[in-house]
Amino acid sequence: MGVEGCTKCIKYLLFVFNFVFWLAGGVILGVALWLRHDPQTTNLLYLELGDKPAPNTFYVGIYILIAVGAVMMFVGFLGCYGAIQESQCLLGTFFTCLVILFACEVAAGIWGFVNKDQIAKDVKQFYDQALQQAVVDDDANNAKAVVKTFHETLDCCGSSTLSALTTSVLKNNLCPSGSNIISNLFKEDCHQKIDDLFSGKLYLIGIAAIVVAVIMIFEMILSMVLCCGIRNSSVY
């Protein structure tokens, strides 16, 4: 005999919630695998600038995406299937996974906050290396793509410590179209924008993390309530 009333509502709520979660995981995993195997993006992600490889943050980034996507699909499946099948075992595993993920999120949040300066430094170093390579080797399309991505995403251009040649090449070729080279280079340069992202905009990342954490706690409560509901319904 299945669950009834409010517990039935929780069952379908948990199902829908986790189905969306499973789909999102699938999209992330798909994009990550595509990035990993597509020749153009592989060049971009494993960019070797001269004799300097891209910082470890970026090298590992793709695998983190793959792992996140896979875990999301797995946990989403557990929640989805566990709810629809009214399986205490699957829901218990789902709850355990959520507890582990919650702990990981807290740990990642603390690590990110503690190492934010190092991460920002890595990002700036990567930008500088890409910019240098784009100027020195004008055939380095992957380096140019990295530089243009930075410029368009952060709406910036160059940094305040540029060589004459780099300034000239940026002005004519790599700055976002219609941008003012003077203001871009000396007022809101990319180094400044990267620093802003990791300090001034840190609260946005914090808000996102809190939202995810609240959703996790909400799912933990729902899964426990449903688990108890299943246990109770099987008694009667």
């Epitope: 004008d138 305040s160 060589s163 004459a164 300034t167 000239s168 002005k171 080279i181």
Partner: antibody
Framework: EVQLLESGGGLVQPGGSLRLSCAAS????????MSWVRQAPGKGLEWVSY????????DYADSVKGRFTISRDNSKNTLYLQMNSLRAEDTAVYYC????????????WGQGTLVTVSS | QSVLTQPFSASGTPGQRVTISCTGS?????????THWYQHLPGTAPKLLIY???NRPSGVPDRFSGSKSGTSASLAISGLRSEDEADYYC???????????FGGGTKLTVLG
Amino acid sequence: EVQLLESGGGLVQPGGSLRLSCAASGFTFSSNYMSWVRQAPGKGLEWVSYISSSSTYTDYADSVKGRFTISRDNSKNTLYLQMNSLRAEDTAVYYCARYSYDRDNFDYWGQGTLVTVSS
Amino acid sequence: QSVLTQPFSASGTPGQRVTISCTGSTSNIGAGYDTHWYQHLPGTAPKLLIYGNSNRPSGVPDRFSGSKSGTSASLAISGLRSEDEADYYCQSYDTNLSVWVFGGGTKLTVLG
């Protein structure tokens, strides 16, 4: 030893055209930015144009923009400057120079070729 | 009128120390762009003398030295020799004009 040898200069009428060449040797030409710098009689040096190693990036001084075109042939280790719609004020000794990314300057120069624009 | 201002001429006797100044603005030397110095004997190829404000390429005697302060730079030649008689040009990059800029040149005469 780095060597840059300019040629193609001479006397030309206003409105005329001229093509300067610069033969390079003693270094990996295809890996270096190259530039043209000129010096009008009794005046100082004036940067004219540069070209990147694979010809992707070029830039010009405002005084020659739209009239001069810089190009290169890496297989021949040669730099060119095509000069059209020449004016009297373009009269100068034109120097070919290698641009060093590391030093961020013109580290080697040729001896120059004289271009005289006169009717 | 050059963007970078240099004295038209300078002179000194052998063994003396001579300084040539190069005055720019906040859009070139003052903007943080390096100043470089070239030696030019008429009819020959200009030669890089000082790069990055104060560095000497290999082969340039240590009698030549460069410095930079604010919007100005200077070239000092100590123990002046007759072969130092030439035109000297300073060079930088101007971010407002987006061009490489040179000084008007200083003609150095070694007297006696």
